[in-house]
Interface confidence: low
């Protein structure tokens, strides 16, 4: 038997992936554990092996199908269980009835690119990845720009309260190296959270023209 507090948290990427993290205070030694997903109204089920991510937490991704296939809807409920092997048996360590569209975390935005750059401004675009068509335009974004001598945590957040897959950064310093990141969140879902930040996009503003005020 395993003592200690257990936390089992999962998010749906809105298409064909459920990512789960299981934390257990009373750490398990050399025990094989899995997450099992059983939808209430579908004929498939899926499992993934929990792999350690720290001393007392494990994670895995339930791959439900092709990345852009719509495997679950707003009416689905998926019974998720953590099962750990105890000798020849499997023991249920945690269980939840998971409502996928109440627990959303989308994939990080991709394909970031500089559309146009000047001395003081830069226009950047991106794409969302594996996001359900159910959202239509009901998405919001946060963006941040890393300036020289600062950290990401210090970067002010820019909020885009609509599905706008571009931004025009202004009041930049000429001939300066910057990095840019963006993340996305659906408006739907009581426990929905922000996607991971995108991979940083590095860009450099143009130098100021010689002999002109900047």
């Amino acid at each position: 038997a395993v003592n200690g507090t257990s936390q089992f948290t999962c998010f749906y990427n809105s298409r064909a992936n459920i990512s789960c993290v299981w934390s257990q205070d009373g750490a398990l030694q050399d025990t094989s554990c899995q997450v099992h997903a059983w939808p209430d109204r579908r004929r498939w089920n899926q499992t993934c092996e929990l792999l350690p991510v720290s001393q007392a937490s494990w994670a895995c991704n339930l791959i439900l199908g092709a990345p852009d296939s719509q495997k679950l809807t707003t009416v689905d409920i998926v019974t998720l269980r953590v099962l750990c092997r105890e000798g020849v048996r499997w023991r249920v360590m945690a269980i939840q009835d998971f409502k996928p569209f109440e627990n959303l975390r989308l994939m990080a935005p991709i394909s970031l690119q500089v559309v146009h750059v000047e001395t003081h401004r830069c226009n950047i675009s991106w794409e969302i990845s594996q996001a359900s068509h159910y959202f239509e335009r009901h998405l919001e974004f946060e963006a941040r720009t890393l300036s020289p001598g600062h950290t990401w945590e210090e970067a002010p957040l820019l909020t885009l309260k609509q599905k706008q897959e571009w931004i025009c950064l202004e009041t930049l310093t000429p001939d300066t190296q910057y990095e840019f990141q963006v993340r996305v969140k659906p408006l739907q879902g009581e426990f929905t959270t922000w996607s991971p930040w995108s991979q940083p996009l590095a860009f450099r503003t143009k130098p100021a023209a010689l002999g002109k005020d900047t």
């Epitope: 899995q34 099992h36 059983w38 209430d40 004929r43 089920n45 019974t79 269980r81 099962l83 020849v88 499997w90 249920v92 269980i95 009835d97």
Partner: nanobody
């Protein structure tokens, strides 16, 4: 290899109660929808009750509805059949069945079966 072992059968008077248990070994219990069937002498095996993997959904044959309750304990790899208000016509060998497909659980030829436990209800 999946194995099912039933227990809890016996002789009981009409109006009495029995609780059958069925333990699954050899695979992950929560993969399976579980069911109870019965076969009276000279009759075909018939579906009695089933419970889905999560325990969320149960199903009963009309003749036992309200008298029998099927349940499962996923920590103990065991499914139960609580039988109350037993009648002489409930006399049969009771079989436990397992199937990974909920929609096939009533199918006699696609289930994994236990060896059965005798229930006799005397009047």
């Amino acid at each position: 290899e999946v194995q099912l072992v039933e227990s809890g059968g016996g002789l009981v008077q009409a109006g009495g109660s029995l609780r059958l248990a069925c333990a699954l070994s050899g695979d992950v219990f929560v993969r399976y929808t579980m069911a109870w069937f019965r076969q009276a002498p000279g009759k075909e095996r018939e579906f009695v009750a089933s419970v889905t993997d999560s325990g969320r959904t149960t199903d009963y044959v009309a003749s036992v509805q309200g008298r029998f309750t099927v349940s499962r304990d996923n920590n103990k790899n065991t499914v139960y059949l609580q039988m109350n208000s037993l009648k002489p016509e409930d006399t049969a060998v009771y079989y436990c069945a397992a199937n990974t497909d909920y929609f096939q659980i009533r199918s006699l030829d696609r289930n994994t079966w236990g060896q059965g436990t005798q229930v006799t209800v005397s009047s």
